[in-house]
Interface confidence: low
């Protein structure tokens, strides 16, 4: 198809080197068609005209994503030639960052439905740039979190360094969706709900004496709990005896409970005691259970191909550890009678 | 990943200490060993310290090596090296796999100590 | 301490071709046994645990059999890169019997 008659957008991607960051392009296609078709209005309901000249499809996934390449080649379809470059409804998700994504994205709809449809595409030139050491050396992280029940704030990673006087109109958007009310360089919010969680989009800005660019920056935010004050607990094994048939396989499993931590470093290991001897045992690896906002369970299991006489005279101890400090149980094998 | 230093010529009756330098490894969950070899000879297990910071020695190496470690560094401290001390001494992480057995799974490229007068 | 006795000193074979290594123990060490293969400058590289387990990345060329005093490595289908001296070791977890390795077996492919 043809894309001279595509609208065109400057984008740039300054990545720090430092942090994994993601990316994120939006079909930004002309208003009206926007609304009717990704369902990002910008609009008002007032303002939503009567007859939408774009007649595309409600299915989110309809759009098309192509990349330009530089030596004139044909357009490449997305997603048969990026695989870290992922398609979500009408959103472009770059996973990693790098100068190899510099290029030109063009979107447009699969169903060309009526005359008005041709030229309904929108084309991306995007410049993706390291960024400098001369930048501020103390910008925002590209993950944030905010604490639940308390006041916080979300800054754009590419203008937290300037102060709020200085700094341009910013347009932010949320999981997609424009927050219209927002323009400075930092959401404030009053009290933080689960629901504040999500992908956060800031986009401002930038001209020069030839052309303007809009500078983008993502920002994953986290809705997260305080972190605990309280060791880990062991849930299993609760008794400290437990009966075995010798010459039989065992395993034996360790699951503990650890409260949430910003800083989350668990450790749960078994090791045996015999007489004078301890011992570690380190396999099988440990396994995240069931994971919330609030706590995770891990379970880390020791296996015996077969239990022998002298497995009874040793102790085996799940040992669980946090920040705050750890948490031992001990099993002893006995022999099943009868 | 896993490595020695501090091998050098060194005169019988002198003391040597060898560093095993680890990184990506938590000496709070693994056990380290060191194991030499002479020239031209097999290898021989001198001792392991366990996570938890206990060591074992093989029964000719008692009293003669010292294993001692930080969060980060295992050494072994040879206390009056003989002619016979001569060997790449080799640091290896010990793990203890499934069925209760331990052995070597990670091994660092050795450090050579030469004692000679 | 368990003393590990390895037989023979050397074994040569031809490409393709197979060959047994022997470990004796001087007590029973019920599976507790690895076996390591060391070429020329290099540390040594574990191939089997618990007697006959398959170490991660290894070839199953590589077999292990045996309990209690007598062990064995075979190596079938045997290649250029397989020539090494190759060691057993005791593995019994137990505060005298810790460590010991067996002489060393030279295999030779010809």
């Known amino acids: 198809f043809n894309i001279s008659g595509c609208s065109t957008k400057k984008l740039l991607w300054t990545y720090s080197t430092r942090s994994e960051e993601e990316f994120v392009l939006f079909c930004d296609l002309p208003e009206p068609q926007k609304s009717h078709f990704c369902h990002r209005n910008r609009l008002s309901p007032k303002q939503v005209p009567e007859h939408l000249p774009f007649m595309g499809s409600n299915d989110l996934s309809d759009v098309q994503w192509y990349q330009q390449p530089s030596n004139g080649d044909p357009l490449e379809d997305i997603r048969k030639s990026y695989p870290h470059i992922i398609q979500d409804k009408c959103t472009l998700h770059f996973l990693t960052p790098g100068v190899n994504n510099s290029g030109s994205y063009i979107c447009r709809p699969k169903m060309i439905k009526s005359p008005y449809d041709v030229a309904c595409c929108v084309k991306m030139i995007l410049e993706v740039k390291p960024q400098t050491n001369a930048s501020c050396e103390y910008s925002a992280s590209h993950k944030q979190d905010l604490l639940l029940g308390s006041t916080g704030s979300i800054s754009c990673p590419s203008l937290s360094c300037q102060s709020d006087a200085q700094s341009p109109a910013v347009t932010w958007y949320k999981n997609g969706k424009l927050l219209s009310v927002e323009r400075s360089n930092r959401i404030v919010v009053d009290e933080v709900y689960d629901y504040h969680q999500g992908t956060y989009v800031c986009d401002y800005t930038q001209s020069d004496t030839v052309s303007s660019w809009t500078v983008r920056a993502v920002v994953q935010v986290r809705t997260i709990v305080g972190d605990t004050k309280l060791k880990p607990d062991i849930l299993d094994p609760v008794e400290d005896t437990l009966e075995v048939e010798l010459g039989k396989p065992l395993t034996i499993s360790c699951k503990a409970r650890f409260g949430f931590e910003r800083v989350f470093n668990p450790v749960i290991k078994w090791y045996i005691k015999d007489s004078d001897l301890e011992w570690e045992v380190s396999v099988p690896e440990a396994k995240s259970i069931k994971s919330t906002l609030k706590d995770e369970i891990i379970e880390r299991n020791i296996i015996l191909e077969k239990v022998t006489q002298r497995d009874l005279r040793r102790k085996f101890v799940c040992f669980v550890q946090n920040s705050i400090g750890n948490t031992t149980q001990s099993v002893q094998l006995k022999e099943k009678r009868g | 990943s896993v490595e020695e230093s501090g091998g050098r010529l060194v005169t019988p009756g002198g003391s040597l200490t060898l560093t095993c330098t680890v990184s990506?490894?938590?000496?709070?969950?693994?056990?380290m060993s060191w194991v030499r070899q002479a020239p031209g000879k097999g290898l021989e297990w001198i001792g392991i310290?366990?996570?938890?910071?206990n060591t074992y020695y093989a029964s000719w190496a008692k009293g003669r090596f010292t294993i001692s470690k930080t969060s980060t560094t295992v050494d072994l401290k040879i206390t009056s090296p003989a002619t016979g001390d001569t060997a790449t001494y080799f640091c290896?992480?010990?793990?203890?796999?499934?069925?209760?057995?331990?052995?070597?799974?990670?091994w660092g490229p050795g450090t050579l100590v030469t004692v000679s007068s | 301490d368990v003393v590990m006795t390895q037989t023979p000193a050397s074994a040569s074979a031809a490409v393709g071709g197979t060959v047994t290594i022997n470990c004796q123990a001087s007590?029973?060490?019920?599976?507790?046994l690895a076996w390591y293969q060391q070429k020329p400058g290099q540390p040594p590289k574990l191939l089997i645990y618990?007697?006959?387990a398959l170490a991660s990345g290894v070839p199953s060329r590589f077999k292990g059999s045996g309990s209690g005093t007598e062990f064995a490595l075979t190596i079938s289908d045997l290649e250029c890169d397989d020539a090494a001296i190759y060691y057993c070791q005791c593995t019994f977890w137990d505060i005298n019997n810790f460590g010991g390795f067996g002489g060393g077996t030279e295999v030779v492919v010809k």
């Open positions: 310290i366990t996570f938890s910071g």
């Open positions: 007590e029973n060490i019920a599976n507790h």
């Open positions: 990506g490894i938590d000496l709070s969950v693994y056990a």
């Open positions: 618990s007697a006959s």
């Open positions: 290896a992480r010990f793990d203890f796999l499934v069925g209760l057995t331990y052995a070597g799974v990670l």
